[in-house]
Amino acid sequence: PEPPTACREKQYLINSQCCSLCQPGQKLVSDCTEFTETECLPCGESEFLDTWNRETHCHQHKYCDPNLGLRVQQKGTSETDTICTCEEGWHCTSEACESCVLHRSCSPGFGVKQIATGVSDTICEPCPVGFFSNVSSAFEKCHPWTSCETKDLVVQQAGTNKTDVVCGPQDRLRA
């Protein structure tokens, strides 16, 4: 490598001097000079800065508003923002998780393929042949039709994607 033709990686140029940036968790109070150092101060209780910076103000931690169905998943530090997630039964409306909506239920004829999390909605799938769901649920998968044969019974009414088969006794031939 050749000698520098710009300030180094963790530096910035001000008044012809390459000054050290403030490290994550600290804000800039004063720039360096030939004789003095960059002066940095730690962010306050509910503040953070997550990069090497020359910011004169720290960012406020995100507020997880319970009125929007939010709760704290991970408390913020001086170097990281607070991470919000949704209350049980709700999920985030965006990646930033600024508000929550109720988990979707899967209608009859559909089962849960993937249960919702704090950040993703319920994923439903249509019940294939041989399976049914007769409820609206955010948890229930499609159930297999009852096997009449294993119970020594016969199918009296065929199943659908919303109903189970109906089994009945076999007709016995009388002599």
Epitope: P4, A6, R8, S16, L21, Q23, E34, E37
Partner: antibody, heavy 126, light 107 residues
Framework: QVQLVQSGAEVKKSGASVKVSCKAS????????IHWVRQAPGQGLEWMGW????????NYAQKFQGRVTMTRDTSISTAYMELSRLRSDDTAVYYC???????????????????WGQGTLVTVSS | DIQMTQSPSSLSASVGDRVTITCRAS??????LGWYQQKPGKAPKRLIY???SLQSGVPSRFSGSGSGTEFTLTISSLQPEDFATYYC?????????FGGGTKVEIK
């Protein structure tokens, strides 16, 4: 205030290795490169190389390539210079110095050193 | 490597004298050069960068000039505290190289 404090004098046998430390205080250690310069008794100054304390990247003078290793421990704001296969002509005072850059127009960046460590005398006896 | 040839290697002068030290680079280095002062048992101290800008806090009797391959450090009126060894340092290309030094002694 800003200072670099080096480890004490060392006496080593020919063929051995020496590791000199340089503890920084009063500034953000990761923000400035550390250079190493040596001075044999009654002789001039000789640049050995630098280390970027943030990434650990190094740049050594060709003369010392293969014999010098510069490392750092950011948790204790300390840079190290290890010189192996010592010879009697390695007897010198070893200085660490913080690099400062001043923009002097266009792509000109003046490289200067401030502060310097107090120096560590390494004596190599045969 | 860029060779820095400094002259004279030593000189004797009296307080009040004008002193000139020269540094010659083996190839052009623009004005990528600094001057350092070193007193016995101490680390060097920067005086001038790049080539002609005086470090803040350094007395104005020190001045630097030159560009390309020829550089000069001048002390207009030598003071008792100026007796020391002076080095030039080129930072145009790696490896950084120092001149051999000029020892300024009391006559």
């Amino acid at each position: 205030q800003v200072q670099l404090v080096q480890s004490g004098a060392e006496v080593k046998k020919s063929g051995a290795s020496v590791k000199v430390s340089c503890k920084a205080s009063g500034y953000t250690f990761a923000g400035y490169y550390i250079h190493w310069v040596r001075q044999a008794p009654g002789q001039g100054l000789e640049w050995m190389g630098w280390i970027n304390p943030d990434s650990g990247d190094t740049n050594y003078a060709q003369k010392f390539q293969g014999r010098v290793t510069m490392t750092r421990d950011t948790s204790i704001s300390t840079a190290y210079m290890e010189l192996s296969r010592l010879r009697s002509d390695d007897t010198a005072v070893y200085y660490c110095a913080r690099e400062r850059l001043t923009h002097c127009g266009g792509d000109c960046y003046s490289q200067w050193f401030d502060p310097w460590g107090q120096g560590t005398l390494v004596t190599v006896s045969s | 490597d860029i060779q820095m040839t400094q002259s004279p290697s030593s000189l004797s002068a009296s307080v009040g004298d004008r002193v000139t030290i020269t540094c010659r680079a083996s190839q052009g280095i623009r004005n990528d050069l600094g001057w350092y002062q070193q007193k016995p048992g101490k680390a060097p101290k920067r005086l001038i960068y790049p080539a002609s800008s005086l470090q803040s806090g350094v007395p104005s009797r020190f001045s630097g000039s030159g560009s390309g391959t020829e550089f000069t450090l001048t002390i207009s009126s030598l003071q008792p505290e100026d007796f020391a060894t002076y080095y030039c340092l080129q930072h145009n290309s790696y490896p950084l190289t120092f001149g051999g030094g000029t020892k300024v002694e009391i006559k």
